[in-house]
Interface confidence: low
C-alpha cells in the first residue's frame, strides 16, 4: 500500500512544485521525494523497507500520476543510499538518497529545490507547505493529482508532551500541526518547504493522521547537511 497521504489539503497548482518526486515501486506510487540535485532525490529510508526485489523508479515532472504530461519522465534508480543509522523500528535518521540513472532533464516542471544548511529550528507558527500523492481521506481515496497543504510548525516542547510524541522528537526532527490537516505515512519522503527552502522530509513512521494530539514529524535536513553533501559529492 502507498505510504502516505495529505489530509485536509487541496489539489496543488500543476507543476508549481517542480522539485516534487513520486518514488514508485513496480510502477505504483509508494512515497514522496524531493529533487535536491540534478541526479539525486531525497526521500525517507523507511520507504524502501518493503521494496525488497521490486523495481524502484522515480517519477519527475508530474502533476497527474496517470495522465500523459509533456514534462513527465520516469527514471530508474542507479543507487539507493539510506542513512547509515536509520533503523526499521525508529523514526530517527529516516532519510534516503536515490541516485537517478542519469541527470534529470531540467525545465519549468523539473528543478531541484534548495535545502536548508543552517542548523536552526524553524520558528513555531511558520506556515510550511507539504505535498504528496497519498490518500486524501480516512476512507482511503487516493488522488491522481498532486495534493498539498499548509501547516504551521509546532514547537518541539509541545510536540514532546506526554500526550503528543512523549519525548521522541530529537533536535534532528521537527513537528507541524495535525489538526484535521496533515501529512501521513506514505507522503513519507515528501518535502516540507518553508519560505521556498526544503526544511524537512516527511517521516514514515506509523502515526494516526489528522489528530491534533499526534503532530506530523519531519526530519530536519539541515541536521544532515554533512551526510547529504558526502553522498552527493
Amino acid at each position: 500500500p502507498p505510504r502516505g497521504r495529505i489530509l485536509g489539503g487541496r489539489e496543488a497548482e500543476a507543476h508549481a512544485r517542480p522539485y516534487m518526486a513520486s518514488v514508485q515501486l513496480n510502477g505504483a506510487h509508494l512515497c514522496g521525494g524531493v529533487l535536491v540535485a540534478e541526479q539525486w532525490v531525497l526521500s525517507a529510508a523507511h520507504c524502501l523497507e518493503d521494496a525488497a526485489d521490486g523495481k524502484v523508479q522515480v517519477l519527475l515532472g508530474a502533476h497527474s500520476l496517470s495522465q500523459p504530461e509533456p514534462s513527465k519522465r520516469l527514471y530508474d534508480v542507479l543507487r539507493a543510499v539510506p542513512h547509515p543509522d536509520s533503523q526499521p523500528d525508529t523514526i530517527d535518521h529516516d532519510l534516503l538518497l536515490l541516485q537517478l540513472s542519469e541527470k534529470a532533464t531540467l525545465g519549468p516542471a523539473v528543478r531541484p529545490l534548495p535545502w536548508q544548511r543552517v542548523d536552526r529550528d524553524v520558528a513555531p507558527g511558520t506556515l510550511c507547505d507539504v505535498a504528496g500523492w497519498g490518500i486524501v481521506n480516512h476512507a482511503g481515496r487516493r488522488p491522481d493529482s498532486l495534493q498539498h497543504v499548509l501547516l504551521p510548525v509546532l514547537d518541539r516542547a509541545t510536540c514532546n508532551r506526554r500526550t503528543h510524541h512523549d519525548g521522541a522528537i530529537t533536535e534532528r526532527l521537527m513537528c507541524a500541526e495535525s489538526n484535521r490537516r496533515d501529512s501521513c505515512k506514505g507522503d513519507s519522503g515528501g518535502p516540507l518547504v518553508c519560505g521556498g527552502v526544503l526544511e524537512g522530509v516527511v517521516t514514515s513512521g506509523s502515526r494516526v493522521c489528522g489528530n491534533r494530539k499526534k503532530p506530523g514529524i519531519y526530519t530536519r535536513v539541515a541536521s544532515y547537511a554533512a551526510w547529504i553533501d558526502s553522498v552527493l559529492a
Epitope: 507558527g125 509546532l154 506526554r162 512523549d166 519525548g167 500541526e177 489538526n179 491534533r212 494530539k213
Partner: antibody, heavy 114, light 108 residues
Framework: EVLLQQSGPELVKPGASVKIPCKAS????????IDWVKQSHGKSLEWIGD????????NYNQKFKGKATLTVDKSSSTAYMELRSLTSEDTAVYYC???????WGQGTLVTVSA | QIVLTQSPAFMSASPGEKVTLTCSAS???????LYWYQQKPGSSPKLWIY???NLASGVPGRFSGSGSGTSYSLTISSMEAEDAASYFC?????????FGAGTKLELK
C-alpha cells in the same frame, strides 16, 4: 470518572518546605502528564511545570526552577510537588491538572506565615 | 514567553445580553492550543473551550469561541446568571504555557 485528589490546606513557616500530593484515579496514570499551576489570591494562573509519570521527564517554568520539585509514585498513582525555602510570595492555591488541562484537582492552599 | 492580555478585566452584563471577552497574545499562537477556562470563587478552573472554538463537555451552546494568530475571543450569545464567573484564556503553543490575567464577568 477522572479524579485528582489534593491534600488540605497547609500553614507553614518561612524558610520551610511543603510537599503536596495529587492522587489520580479513573484513568491510566501513565497516559497523561501531570501539570502544576499556581494561583495567588485574586490573581491569575501560573504554570509551574509538568511531569511525565511514565518516565519521570519534567518540564519546568524557569521561574520555578529551584523552588518546585516534581516527582511521581507510579505504584500509588500519585504526583507530588515539593516547594522549598518558602516565603510570603509562595502563599497561593496550587493545582494539579491532567489530560492537557481537561481535569484539575481541587487545589491546595499553602499559607506561609510566621 | 507569550503574554496573554485579556480585556476587559471586569465587566457587568444583564441577563440576555451578548457578551464578548477578548484575549490578545504578544506573538502568534496556534489555534489548536488556545484554551479558555471558567472559574467560580472557591472552585478549581474548569476547561470551558479548547482549540479556540470547541466547547468542553457540559458547556452550554450559548458559548462560542473564535480567533486566530494573536487575537481570540469568547462570546456568550445571551448572558445567564450561572455564567457569572472569571474567565481565563490560556496558550500552550510554546513553553512555558501562559494564562491571561482573566476577565471577571458579573451579572448586572
Amino acid at each position: 470518572e477522572v479524579l485528582l485528589q489534593q491534600s488540605g490546606p497547609e500553614l507553614v513557616k518561612p524558610g520551610a518546605s511543603v510537599k503536596i500530593p495529587c492522587k489520580a484515579s479513573g484513568y491510566t496514570f501513565t497516559d497523561y502528564n501531570i501539570d502544576w499551576v499556581k494561583q495567588s489570591h485574586g490573581k491569575s494562573l501560573e504554570w509551574i511545570g509538568d511531569i511525565n509519570p511514565n518516565n519521570g521527564g519534567i518540564n519546568y517554568n524557569q521561574k520555578f526552577k529551584g523552588k518546585a520539585t516534581l516527582t511521581v509514585d507510579k505504584s500509588s498513582s500519585t504526583a507530588y510537588m515539593e516547594l522549598r525555602s518558602l516565603t510570603s510570595e509562595d502563599t497561593a492555591v496550587y493545582y494539579c491538572g491532567t489530560g492537557d488541562y481537561a481535569y484539575w484537582g481541587q487545589g491546595t492552599l499553602v499559607t506561609v506565615s510566621a | 514567553q507569550i503574554v496573554l492580555t485579556q480585556s476587559p478585566a471586569f465587566m457587568s452584563a444583564s441577563p440576555g445580553e451578548k457578551v464578548t471577552l477578548t484575549c490578545s497574545a504578544s506573538s502568534s499562537v496556534s489555534s489548536s492550543y488556545l484554551y479558555w477556562y471558567q472559574q467560580k470563587p472557591g472552585s478549581s478552573p474548569k476547561l470551558w473551550i479548547y482549540s479556540t472554538s470547541n466547547l468542553a463537555s457540559g458547556v452550554p451552546g450559548r458559548f462560542s469561541g473564535s480567533g486566530s494568530g494573536t487575537s481570540y475571543s469568547l462570546t456568550i450569545s445571551s448572558m445567564e446568571a450561572e455564567d457569572a464567573a472569571s474567565y481565563f484564556c490560556h496558550q500552550w503553543t510554546s513553553y512555558p504555557p501562559t494564562f491571561g490575567a482573566g476577565t471577571k464577568l458579573e451579572l448586572k
